[in-house]
């Protein structure tokens, strides 16, 4: 085109892929008149002519913009829809008259692309790698034209560095026409590269200007040899027997190495290998004051077959031995005197108590509890606990039972028991003494005797209500070596609709079951009479 | 074009050593990693082991003491040795290159039976 | 490790049916996932990469979508030639594959 050098450059217009691109014609009334125009497009060098524009109306030549393009303002303007990427090309107009003149529009087309993918690699790096190994791959799909892509770790650009850092990028053009990008990252990590975080980001531009996507940010699986391996124990602290305790063999390597946890044996001082579970770790459940001693570990890489043993660790499982009561088994004579002594071994200082069993009371903080003038009271339980006051729940206790020599001492001396005639009544007798007491009952019927403690015993009797009995009533007698005693229980008709629930009465030992003719269930329940005050 | 091709023994005897070689063309190996995947009769993929183009290598933990991988670069070519062989080793041996943590391509397979 | 467990096992269908296939991973494996296609005797072929990219050479009617945990392979209009045994495959951590589904003509 003759004076083509001498072109001023060409309008530029930007547009997004898919939307409408408007290519105004430039040429001013002198140049041309606008109802009389021809729009070419311009593809390496060679202009098609696409619409034509005659008295102002707009015709559409065939071919691939055929569907796509109409005018607009009154003429001076043509509409381009649907830009893809192929439309980024010159576009001109041409007016007729006076003279031929031409203005030329470049059409640039963008599109952002999408979110960044990033991707790890899956088997991971390294750290002694010989050369740079692929970290990630960041593809940026369907942008136009190609976006630009940085990649960053903890939040700083890496640059290209010689057989340390290689940035390797290219691209494939879609079907669509848009770029799909991708980079990947070579590098050559160290130990320290474990918790760094990478991402990439794309670059690319929009008629609205400059813009940049991220991703998401990754870590890389580092691979690094062991240098320390250590050992741990849970709980921490001070243990004691019976706690549940994990002995744990650590190290700084990654994939971490396979370990073995032995203990010193102190009698051949030769290391014994303890069993460990899957994972390596020792588990002592329940620990035992055995447990105790030196444990170390040593850890194999399996590729070199090099070991490495850590620092010893010596395990101290606290413990209290079983208690010792002297006497074990003590008897006394009313008005004397007692002493009960403990013992007990433990691996740290001991605390004693001595505590009375029926009211958990505590009588002596000592390991010898002194008793004076010995009464009938004083008779039953008392406890020896040995206790290790630094860790707490680490005790062990003894149970001493005393005996005070004296004749039978009842339960009550006399009990009224609510009856109905023909019922069969299980009436209890209770008594207490050194040497234990036998019951004996003065009335026939099925008796069953049994031991509450050494010193304690409950005799029952099933025993049919008739009307002598009711006449006499029933005594049951407790007798020993020392004495005896007796208890008496009276017997009273009751009409049962009498007795509510509200009736101020207690529920004693007695129940009736049902009556020999009928052997229906039915029950009587015993009113107690208050209590004598000695029970002797 | 880029092909892979295993070859190897078809046949092995229980606790013997195989030997697999996996001869590669259209790309380097210094450009591409390659990795052995295996499939026993009527069972799924299961990856074995990879060497990056780096010349790291990985191996599954399930296999890991029995396994080694090489290559020799100069003659294109992965070698993998599976020790102390076992019947349920019995499977298609695949090995197929890395694009670069994907596998776009795979060789046809050997067949590789355990059996005394 | 990532287990991938893939439905149904087996399928039978009509030429020209839409055919989905499901992969569902045991933790957030984002866009590692690839699907493969194997027939006896032949070279296995990388049909999708990056969960949804589909590779070059592969017809249009193979198509994948997901990211996360759940995947998958869609077959629009199924053709003779897709008879094989299809796998999914993870490369987020290691390598793991699905079970396989074996896809049939009724």
């Known amino acids: 085109v003759p004076g083509e050098a001498e072109q001023p450059a060409p309008e530029l217009v930007e547009v997004e892929v898919g939307s409408t691109a408007l290519l105004k014609c430039g040429l001013s009334q002198s140049q041309g008149n606008l109802s009389h125009v021809d729009w070419f497009s311009v593809h390496k060098e060679k202009r098609t002519l696409i619409f034509r524009v005659r008295q102002g109306q707009g015709q559409s030549e065939p071919g691939e913009y055929e569907q796509r393009l109409s005018l607009q303002d009154r003429g001076a303007t043509l509409a381009l829809t649907q830009v893809t990427p192929q439309d980024e090309r010159i576009f001109l107009c041409q007016g007729k008259r006076p003279r031929s003149q031409e203005y030329r529009i470049q059409l640039r087309v963008y599109k952002a692309p999408e979110e960044p993918n990033i991707q790890v690699n899956p088997l991971g790096i390294p750290v002694n790698s010989k050369e740079p190994e692929e970290v990630a791959t960041c593809v940026g799909r369907n942008g136009y034209p190609i976006p630009q892509v940085i990649w960053y770790k903890n939040g700083r650009p890496l640059k290209e560095e010689k057989n340390r850092v290689h940035i390797q990028s290219s691209q494939t053009v879609e079907s669509s026409g848009l770029y799909t990008l991708q980079s990947i990252l070579k590098a050559q990590l160290v130990k320290e590269d474990k918790d760094a975080q990478f991402y990439c980001e794309l670059n690319y531009r929009l008629p609205s200007g400059n813009h940049m996507k991220e991703s998401r940010e990754v870590t890389v699986p580092v691979f690094y040899p062991t240098e320390k391996v250590w050992l741990e124990v849970e709980p921490v602290g001070m243990l004691k027997e019976g706690d549940r305790v994990e002995i744990r063999c650590l190290a700084d390597g990654n994939p971490p190495p396979h370990f073995s946890i032995s203990k010193g044996n102190p009698s051949t001082r030769e290391a014994e290998e303890e069993t460990t579970n899957d994972n390596g770790v020792l588990v002592l459940e329940p620990a035992r004051k055995e447990h105790s001693g030196r444990y170390e570990c040593q850890a194999w890489n399996l590729d070199t077959m090099i070991s490495l043993l850590s620092e010893p660790q010596e395990l101290l499982v606290n413990y209290v031995s079983d208690v010792r009561v002297s006497p074990a088994a003590p008897e006394r004579q009313e008005g004397s005197s007692l002493t009960l002594t403990c013992e007990a071994e433990s691996s740290q200082d001991l605390e004693f108590q001595w505590l009375r069993e029926e009211t958990d009371q505590v009588l002596e903080r000592g390991p010898v509890l002194q008793l004076h003038d010995l009464k009938r009271e004083a008779g039953g339980g008392y406890r020896c606990v040995a206790s290790v006051p630094s860790i707490p729940g680490l005790n062990r206790t003894q149970l001493v039972k005393l005996a005070i020599f004296g004749p039978p001492w009842m339960a009550f001396k006399e009990r009224k028991v609510w009856v109905k005639e023909n019922m069969v009544l299980n009436l209890s007798c209770e008594a207490s003494g050194h040497p234990r007491p036998t019951i004996s009952w003065n009335v026939n019927g099925t008796a069953s005797e049994g031991d509450q403690d050494p010193q304690r015993v409950l005799s029952t009797l099933n025993v049919l209500v008739t009307p002598e009995l009711l006449e006499t009533g029933v005594e049951c007698t407790a007798s020993n070596d020392l004495g005896k005693n007796t208890s008496i229980l009276f017997l009273e008709l009751v009409n049962l609709t009498t007795l509510t629930p509200d009736s101020n009465t207690t529920t004693g030992l007695s129940t009736s079951t049902a009556s020999p003719h009928t052997r229906a269930n039915s029950t009587s329940t015993e009113r107690k009479l208050p209590e004598p005050e000695s029970r002797g | 074009q880029v092909t892979l091709k295993e070859s190897g023994p078809v046949l092995v005897k229980p606790t013997e050593t195989l030997t697999l070689t996996c001869t590669v063309s259209g790309f380097s190996l210094t450009s591409n990693g390659v990795s052995w995947v295996r499939q026993p009769p009527g069972k799924a993929l299961e990856w074995i082991a990879a060497i990056s183009s780096g010349g790291s290598t990985y191996y599954n933990s399930a296999f890991k003491s029995r396994l080694s991988i090489s290559r020799d670069t100069s003659k294109s070519q992965v070698v993998l040795t599976m020790t102390n062989m076992d019947p349920v080793d019995t499977a298609t041996y695949y090995c197929?290159?890395?694009?670069?943590?994907?596998?776009?391509?795979w060789g046809q397979g050997t067949l590789v039976t355990v059996s005394s | 490790d990532i287990q991938m467990t893939q439905s149904p096992s087996s399928l039978s269908a009509s030429v020209g049916d839409r055919v989905t296939i499901t992969c569902k991973g045991s933790q957030n494996i984002y866009k590692s996932l690839a699907w493969f296609q194997l027939k006896p005797g032949k070279v296995p072929k990388l049909l999708i990469y990056?969960?949804?990219s589909l590779q070059t050479g592969i017809p249009s009617r193979f198509s994948g979508s997901g990211s996360g945990t759940d995947f998958t392979l869609t077959i629009s209009s199924l053709q003779p030639e897709d008879v094989a045994t299809y796998y999914c495959?993870?490369?987020?951590?290691?390598?793991?594959f699905g079970g396989g589904t074996k896809v049939e003509i009724k």
């Open positions: 990056d969960a949804n």
């Open positions: 197929a290159r890395h694009r670069p943590f994907y596998f776009d391509y």
């Open positions: 495959q993870q490369y987020y951590s290691g390598y793991t």
